[in-house]
């Protein structure tokens, strides 16, 4: 990899237009940004506002309940993952506005763009944990009565976070900053050296572990849960189904473009028209995936209103009812009584 520094003594004689002046990071490729980049900026702005405020509120509501309510632990962790990812958005936004110039240094280049992947893995792993919890509540209620506790929930979350960090390492390691001489700017990007196989391997692992495998396992898991719920004629089974569908749908909708473009670009020749088109859509796909970071609080509010008709309640109160309702372990009723907390599902579908 290139050693990176901000001075270019060898090129000092390149005057006027030719000077690499990193203090004026202007890529004047055209006077305006490309349409996909403009759309990405709009999405980033909305996600930042909704994501920071919404997830901060969720953290505030669940933090007080996390000691005694397991569902609160799940939602707290999901909200933290989303909140952390949202913190990178002002930097990513600024970079796109400057035609992807990156004046923030190497450490920021490694960390900030990797946060969305950390969020993806953390969310998916937490969703798997919540799904396992839902499954056990329905199929192993006695086990839950004996062993399901806050301590175990925190351990499960810690394991999920640890695995998520491990899975994000490749993205972190391969990110570098590099000077571009024409147009003059600094770029933050992924460098797999010239090894296309390594790039493909990373893309495949990301697709399988971050998308296909969780999708398969969660679909199977919830199919069993819903079949059991229906067979017991649970009072809220249709509402449970709606939440589950919302979870799976959001997972598909928001991560699919990112995953598909990622895997396609790793297999396509860089000069092919398809590759070039996908490259132009890169920022838009990332921003689309980022919607996951703000969608959970919206789903909680919608679900809270839909299930309880609490339109007149304050937002924190509504969220508290949705996020901290504890499961009562009584066979299938244990599931239906706390149907709302299947929302946990959604949150990590992201």
């Amino acid at each position: 990899m290139d050693s990176f520094n901000y001075t270019t003594p060898d090129y000092g004689h390149y005057d006027d237009k030719d000077t690499l002046d990193l203090n004026t990071p202007v890529d004047k490729t055209s006077n305006t940004l490309r349409v996909p980049d403009i759309l990405a900026l709009v999405i980033f702005a909305v996600v930042f506002l909704v994501g920071v405020l919404g997830n901060a509120l969720v953290v505030w509501v669940t933090a007080f309940e996390a000691k005694r309510t397991i569902n609160a632990i799940w939602f707290l962790n999901l909200a933290v993952a989303d909140f952390l990812s949202c913190l990178a958005l002002p930097i990513l936004f600024t970079s796109i506005v400057q035609h992807h110039h990156w004046p923030f240094g190497g450490a920021a280049c490694s960390i900030l763009p990797s946060l969305i992947l950390l969020n993806m893995y953390a969310s998916i792993l937490l969703l798997a944990t919540i799904s396992a919890d839902r499954f056990l509540l329905v199929f192993k209620p006695i086990w839950c009565q004996n062993f399901r506790g806050a301590g175990l929930a925190w351990i499960a979350c810690a394991v999920a976070w640890g695995l998520a960090l491990l899975l994000t390492i490749p993205s972190f390691l391969y990110r570098v900053v590099r000077e571009e001489y024409f147009p003059p700017k600094v770029l933050c990007g992924v460098d797999y050296s010239h090894d296309k196989r390594r790039e493909r391997a990373v893309a495949i692992v990301r697709l399988v572990l971050g998308f296909l495998w969780p999708l398969l396992t969660l679909t199977i898991c919830y199919t069993f849960i819903l079949l059991r719920t229906w067979s017991r004629r649970a009072t809220r089974s249709t509402k449970t189904l709606k939440v589950v569908v919302a979870v799976v749908a959001s997972f598909f909708i928001f991560w699919l473009p990112y995953q598909v473009t990622g895997i396609m670009m790793s297999f396509l020749e860089p000069s092919s028209p398809t590759f070039l088109l996908l490259k132009k859509l890169d920022s838009l796909c990332v921003s689309f995936a980022y919607i996951n970071c703000c969608i959970n609080p919206i789903i909680y509010v919608v679900a809270g209103q839909g299930f309880q008709g609490r339109l007149r309640k304050s937002l924190p109160s509504l969220l508290r009812n949705v996020l901290t309702e504890e499961s009562v372990v009584r066979e299938s009723k244990s599931f239906t009584r706390s149907t709302v907390d299947t929302m946990a599902q959604k949150t990590q579908a992201v």
């Epitope: 990899m1 290139d2 060898d10 090129y11 390149y14 237009k17 030719d18 890529d27 004047k28 490729t29 055209s30 006077n31 490309r34 980049d37 035609h99 992807h100 590099r178 571009e180 001489y181 024409f182 147009p183 770029l187 990007g189 992924v190 460098d191 050296s193 010239h194 090894d195 860089p270 000069s271 028209p273 070039l276 490259k279 132009k280 890169d282 920022s283």
Partner: antibody, heavy 124, light 108 residues
Framework: EVQLQQSGPELVKPGASVKISCKAS????????MSWMKQSHGKSLEWIGD????????IYNQKFKGKATLTVDRSSSTAYMDLRSLTSEDSAVYYC?????????????????WGTGTTVTVSS | EIVLTQSPTTMAASPGEKITITCSAT???????LHWYQQKPGFSPKLLIY???NLASGVPARFSGSGSGTSYSLTIGTMEAEDVATYYC?????????FGSGTKLEIK
């Protein structure tokens, strides 16, 4: 089919100027930056400079500053190179070649399509 | 300026023979920025290999590239008559972009 069609051979007198054209077809002209290269008879290639077709921004090899001027006409998808104050040293084949500029990630500056070449002969 | 020196300058090979051309740089280059071109007599150069080891579209699999730092090589697994050409390496990492001195490959 992607093509870079260059203008025909030029025979010019020392001290004169010449304008070589490179017409692009088969792709979006503004997606690729254009480079120009010089190849003297029996010798290797020398990079002259690059031009951004979107706005005309350019960068030159210091060796060719004052000798070459790069311009574009977006409406006709054509790149031009002006060579002035010609001497026998400027007798060569000149090529245009495109390279893709990635806005959001590293560009590696390899020339995937080359022009047909324009032979410039400077002789009195 | 990074100077690229190719060796050999000229070489003659028999059909079926394995050929290796080397390209040496005066300072280290990231392997992503080293490319190879083929120029047949009377024609324009053509991209052969980009980013050290990736074959350009339509290039036969008998061509391969490798290397890192200051030392790179182009290999033709089994020489064929149509491979008669001059081969150039090129670096795109620094300004000015530079080409190797060229290796002329002939057939015995």
């Amino acid at each position: 089919e992607v093509q870079l069609q260059q203008s025909g051979p030029e025979l010019v007198k020392p001290g004169a100027s010449v304008k070589i054209s490179c017409k692009a077809s088969g792709y979006t002209f503004t997606d690729y930056y254009m480079s120009w290269m010089k190849q003297s008879h029996g010798k290797s290639l020398e990079w002259i400079g690059d031009i951004n077709p979107n706005n005309g921004d350019n960068i030159y090899n210091q060796k060719f500053k004052g000798k070459a001027t790069l311009t574009v006409d977006r409406s006709s998808s054509t790149a031009y190179m002006d060579l002035r104050s010609l001497t026998s040293e400027d007798s060569a084949v000149y090529y245009c070649a495109r390279w893709y500029y990635y806005v959001s990630s590293f560009s590696y500056w390899y020339f995937d399509v080359w022009g047909t070449g324009t032979t410039v002969t400077v002789s009195s | 300026e990074i100077v690229l020196t190719q060796s050999p300058t000229t070489m003659a090979a028999s059909p079926g023979e394995k050929i290796t051309i080397t390209c040496s740089a005066t300072s280290s280059i990231n392997s992503n920025y080293l490319h190879w071109y083929q120029q047949k007599p009377g024609f324009s150069p053509k991209l052969l290999i980009y980013r050290t080891s990736n074959l350009a579209s339509g290039v036969p699999a008998r061509f391969s590239g490798s290397g890192s730092g200051t030392s790179y090589s182009l290999t033709i697994g089994t020489m064929e008559a149509e491979d008669v050409a001059t081969y150039y390496c090129q670096q795109g990492r620094t300004i000015p972009r530079t080409f190797g001195s060229g290796t002329k490959l002939e057939i015995k």
